[in-house]
């Protein structure tokens, strides 16, 4: 029976993933019962990705390592809509690392997942980035401009945002 074997496969995948994320929240995609997309609980979901706000304060490198241990990376923001979704879950008095850095200090910004850096889809605060020694990007709130990006020193501990593709089972 097709449905039975699909369910067995799904359960075995869930069991495998449970050792990393004890609880998954899954939804049926479209009308096809075959496709379930999941995010770990209590991650949030938007389009084809899952997001986790890490409130522990760590350097940029440690923040990225923390995300990768969970099967994610520091967040790569591809659209204004994605940023608008993310900021709903952020606190205005905090700053959060993005998956964006300038390792050489030459203003060659790089996303951790190798997505090409596109000047036309960036949300820097006005006047930012402004320091060649500040090689990592955060998102924070400024009363004059609301949410935007700023360059800071990578070793300064911040909160962070992890992003992973939805888990399909």
């Amino acid at each position: 029976n097709f449905m039975y074997s699909k369910t067995v496969k799904r359960l075995s995948k869930l069991r495998e993933y449970q050792q990393y994320h004890p609880s998954l929240t899954c939804v049926m995609e479209g009308k096809d019962i075959e496709d379930w997309s999941c995010c770990p609980t209590p991650w949030t979901s938007f389009q084809s990705s899952c997001y986790f706000i890490s409130t522990g304060m760590q350097s940029w490198t440690k923040s990225q390592k923390n995300c990768s241990v969970m099967g994610a990376d520091l967040v790569v923001i591809n659209t204004r809509e994605e940023q608008d979704f993310i900021i709903q879950n952020l606190k205005r008095n905090s700053s959060y690392f993005l998956g964006l850095s300038d390792p050489g200090g030459r203003r060659h910004w790089q996303w951790v997942d190798q997505t090409p850096y596109n000047e036309n889809v960036t949300f820097w605060h006005s006047g930012e980035p402004n320091n060649l020694d500040e090689r990592c990007a955060i998102i924070n709130f400024r009363s004059s401009e609301e949410w935007g990006w700023n360059d800071i020193h990578c070793h300064v501990p911040q909160k962070s945002i992890c992003k992973m593709k939805k888990i399909y089972i």
Partner: nanobody, 126 residues
Framework: QVQLQESGGGLVQAGDSLKLSCAAS????????MGWFRQAPGKERDVVAA????????YYVDSVKGRFTISRDNAQNRVYLQMNSLKPEDTAIYYC?????FGSGYYTNKLNYAYWGQGTQVTVSS
Amino acid sequence: QVQLQESGGGLVQAGDSLKLSCAASGRTFSTYAMGWFRQAPGKERDVVAAIATNGGTTYYVDSVKGRFTISRDNAQNRVYLQMNSLKPEDTAIYYCAARLSFGSGYYTNKLNYAYWGQGTQVTVSS
């Protein structure tokens, strides 16, 4: 937590072959995307090859395409790098790396990898 141990390095002549092996212990190996990186003295650690969890998707840096082959054996918890037609410029310490992955992609940025082996030296003499 995943522990990785590379083996198979050594000193060979240009044109020779070597097969590197990386043994993984710890969590379910089949849920980890794997990569081979190398670091020559005074240089950055760069990706050589990468492979997805199911072994179906692979990546090679241009300089090794057609000469190196990455493969994995999920039953044995191992990933391999078969290196043929070795050149002096392949001399480096070779590192195996792992990252948890729930998709079917590979990863080419060293920042994407959470776990690393200690490395194995490969020296190619002319």
